[in-house]
C-alpha cells in the first residue's frame, strides 16, 4: 500500500490549492456563498472543514474540502458546529479561503504541521 504523505507535504499541497483558488477567482467564489466564521477550539483544519463543508455544489472548493478532511482526525458532517463561535458571524467563502491561506502559510513557516 502507498505510504502516507508527510504532513509537511500535505500542508504545502493544501496551501498550493488555496493559492490556485484565490488567483484563479474570476466570478464570485461559490456564487458569493457565506460561511460561519470560527474560533480555534477544534484546531484550524477541523474548524475550517466544519465551516466549508456546509458549502455544497461549489466545485472550486471540493478539493480543499477533501484535503482538509485528511487533516481532521474526526468525522465532520454538514451542520456540525463544535468549533463555531457566535453563530451570527458569517463571512464570504472567498474571504474565508483567503484568511485560511494566510494562516496556513504562517503555520508552515513556523513548522506547525499538526
Amino acid at each position: 500500500s502507498p505510504s502516507p504523505v508527510p504532513r509537511s507535504t500535505a500542508l504545502k499541497e493544501l496551501i498550493e490549492e488555496l493559492v490556485n483558488i484565490t488567483q484563479n477567482q474570476k466570478a464570485p467564489l461559490c456564487n458569493g456563498s457565506m460561511v460561519w466564521s470560527i474560533n480555534l477550539t477544534a484546531g484550524v483544519y477541523c474548524a475550517a472543514l466544519e465551516s466549508l463543508i456546509n458549502v455544497s455544489g461549489c466545485s472550486a472548493i471540493e478539493k480543499t474540502q477533501r484535503m482538509l478532511n485528511g487533516f481532521c482526525p474526526h468525522k465532520v458532517s454538514a451542520g456540525q458546529f463544535s468549533s463555531l463561535r457566535v453563530r451570527d458571524t458569517k463571512i464570504e467563502v472567498a474571504q474565508f479561503v483567503k484568511d485560511l491561506l494566510v494562516h496556513l502559510k504562517k503555520l508552515f513557516r513556523e513548522g506547525r504541521f499538526n
Partner: nanobody
Framework: GVQLLESGGGLVQPGGSLRLSCAAS????????MGWVRQAPGKGLEWVSS????????YYADSVKGRFTISRDNSKNTLYLQMNSLRAEDTAVYYC???????????WGQGTLVTVSS
C-alpha cells in the same frame, strides 16, 4: 466586507489611562496577527504595538514599552490596547490594523483620537 472599528479614545490628562478596543468583523480574526499604529498631528504613521494570532507574542515600540499593553480576545473578535502613564506626545489618532507580511492582507480601521492634555 472586512471591518475594523476602534473605540475608547478621548481626552485624558497626562499620567492618565485609556483602553482602546477594536472590534473586527468580515474576516477570520483569530487567524491574523494584529497591531496598533498611530499618527500624531502633522506627523507620519508610527507603529505602536503588535500581537501574534495566538496572543502569546507581543511587540512594542520603544516609546511605549512598559506603559502600553496589547491584548486580544479571539472569542470576541476584539483587539485591545491598554495605555497607562499617558504623555502629551501620545496624542494621536490610533488605528487598529492587521499585521501580516503577505501583500493583499492590509486591513485598517478608521481610527480613534486620543488627546493627552491638561
Amino acid at each position: 466586507g472586512v471591518q475594523l472599528l476602534e473605540s475608547g479614545g478621548g481626552l485624558v490628562q497626562p499620567g492618565g489611562s485609556l483602553r482602546l478596543s477594536c472590534a473586527a468583523s468580515g474576516f477570520v480574526f483569530p487567524w491574523y496577527d494584529m497591531g496598533w499604529v498611530r499618527q500624531a498631528p502633522g506627523k507620519g504613521l508610527e507603529w505602536v504595538s503588535s500581537i501574534d494570532w495566538k496572543g502569546g507574542k507581543t511587540y512594542y515600540a520603544d516609546s511605549v514599552k512598559g506603559r502600553f499593553t496589547i491584548s486580544r480576545d479571539n472569542s470576541k473578535n476584539t483587539l485591545y490596547l491598554q495605555m497607562n502613564s499617558l504623555r502629551a506626545e501620545d496624542t494621536a489618532v490610533y488605528y487598529c490594523a492587521t499585521a501580516e507580511d503577505e501583500p493583499g492582507y492590509d486591513y485598517w480601521g478608521q481610527g480613534t483620537l486620543v488627546t493627552v492634555s491638561s
